[in-house]
């Protein structure tokens, strides 16, 4: 997993990396395998009804450093993990949803009786 503190520009890989893709397969993927010059990823996020959805696939080198950093997004429960160490390495990534914060249960201001 990429560490939050990493800020150096990503180094181009000398060879293409193959990743498993699910719910996130580009047109050039075959048999749920995509190829990239960047990272493989697996992501878990809540859908509109609050159910966890896992997607996986390829991230191109451009912008992947930021995407793999897993910066928290307000009002969105989501976690992403990235890898490059071997082909289809994202099969072994199992990100978990961050815990609910108290305010996530609250739709509006609290009214005391």
């Amino acid at each position: 997993k990429k560490e939050d503190g990493e800020s150096t520009a990503p180094t181009p890989r000398p060879k293409v990396l193959r990743c498993k893709c699910h719910h996130h397969c580009p047109e050039d993927s075959v048999n749920n395998i995509c190829s990239t010059d960047g990272y493989c990823f697996t992501m878990i996020e809540e859908d509109d009804s609050g159910l966890p959805v896992v997607t996986s696939g390829c991230l191109g080198l451009e912008g992947s450093d930021f995407q793999c950093r897993d910066t928290p997004i307000p009002h969105q429960r989501r976690s992403i993990e990235c890898c490059t160490e071997r082909n289809e390495c994202n099969k072994d990534l199992h990100p978990t949803l961050p815990p609910l914060k108290n305010r996530d249960f609250v739709d509006g201001p609290i009214h005391h009786r």
Epitope: P14, K15, S29, V30, D37, G60, L61, R86, E88
Partner: antibody, heavy 116, light 112 residues
Framework: EVQLVQSGAEVKKPGESLKISCKGS????????MQWVRQMPGKGLEWMGE????????LYNQKFKGQVTISADKSISTAYLQWSSLKASDTAMYYC?????????WGQGTTVTVSS | DIVMTQSPDSLAVSLGERATINCRSS???????????LHWYQQKPGQPPKLLIY???NRFSGVPDRFSGSGSGTDFTLTISSLQAEDVAVYYC?????????FGQGTKLEIK
């Protein structure tokens, strides 16, 4: 200097097995894929498949899947292409080729002749 | 599979003249990363192919600057600006965007 040196020409009978080799030197063998490409007599080039020697991950052209096996031994920087039962139609020149995002270096080729 | 179609199948050009070979793919070769993995190879009799141009327009190291590549999407061109005797060969376009990777049928270039 990047070099891919392939094993010598082979003459085989139908039904026989065969394993040809391709030794890479002058670069980090595990930093590139190795592909195998077939060229039948007087014909064009056909991609058979490839292997990433760092993890032995293979991809095959569906046309050749089950017909050949691609393997590698990173300890001796060598990739292999093998047949368990040759056919006359396997008569061709076989090239190994280094692949990153495109093939940049090719072996000299191994001629395989299958005839009864 | 992506079909790569080259034209013409054969070409005769006078020494010093321009030679142009076209390559058309059955689908776009723009990869999801934004790269276009279309390449050109030269093969002389009894020899393995040699890389000339990678990713549409990048000359490989040691390739003379009379060779150039252009195009986008599905249509690509290899140009030899001034034909030399040593350029007599078969030229192949190739794509590595989609698996299985495929080659054009080849264009035989001769001297007129």
């Amino acid at each position: 200097e990047v070099q891919l040196v392939q094993s010598g020409a082979e003459v085989k009978k139908p039904g026989e097995s065969l394993k040809i080799s391709c030794k890479g030197s002058g670069y980090s063998f595990t930093s590139y894929w190795m592909q195998w490409v077939r060229q039948m007599p007087g014909k064009g080039l056909e991609w058979m498949g490839e292997i990433d020697p760092s993890d032995n991950y293979t991809l095959y052209n569906q046309k050749f899947k089950g017909q050949v096996t691609i393997s590698a031994d990173k300890s001796i920087s060598t990739a292999y292409l093998q047949w368990s039962s040759l056919k006359a139609s396997d008569t061709a020149m076989y090239y190994c080729a280094r692949f990153g995002y495109y093939v940049d270096y090719w072996g000299q080729g191994t001629t395989v002749t299958v005839s009864s | 599979d992506i079909v790569m179609t080259q034209s013409p199948d054969s070409l005769a050009v006078s020494l010093g003249e321009r030679a142009t070979i076209n390559c058309r793919s059955s689908q776009s070769l723009v990869h999801s990363t934004g790269n276009t993995y279309l390449h050109w190879y030269q093969q002389k009799p009894g020899q393995p192919p040699k890389l000339l141009i990678y990713k549409v327009s990048n000359r490989f190291s040691g390739v003379p600057d009379r060779f150039s590549g252009s195009g986008s999407g599905t249509d690509f061109t290899l140009t030899i600006s001034s034909l030399q005797a040593e350029d007599v060969a078969v030229y192949y376009c190739s794509q590595s965007t989609h698996v299985p990777f495929t080659f054009g049928q080849g264009t035989k270039l001769e001297i007129k």
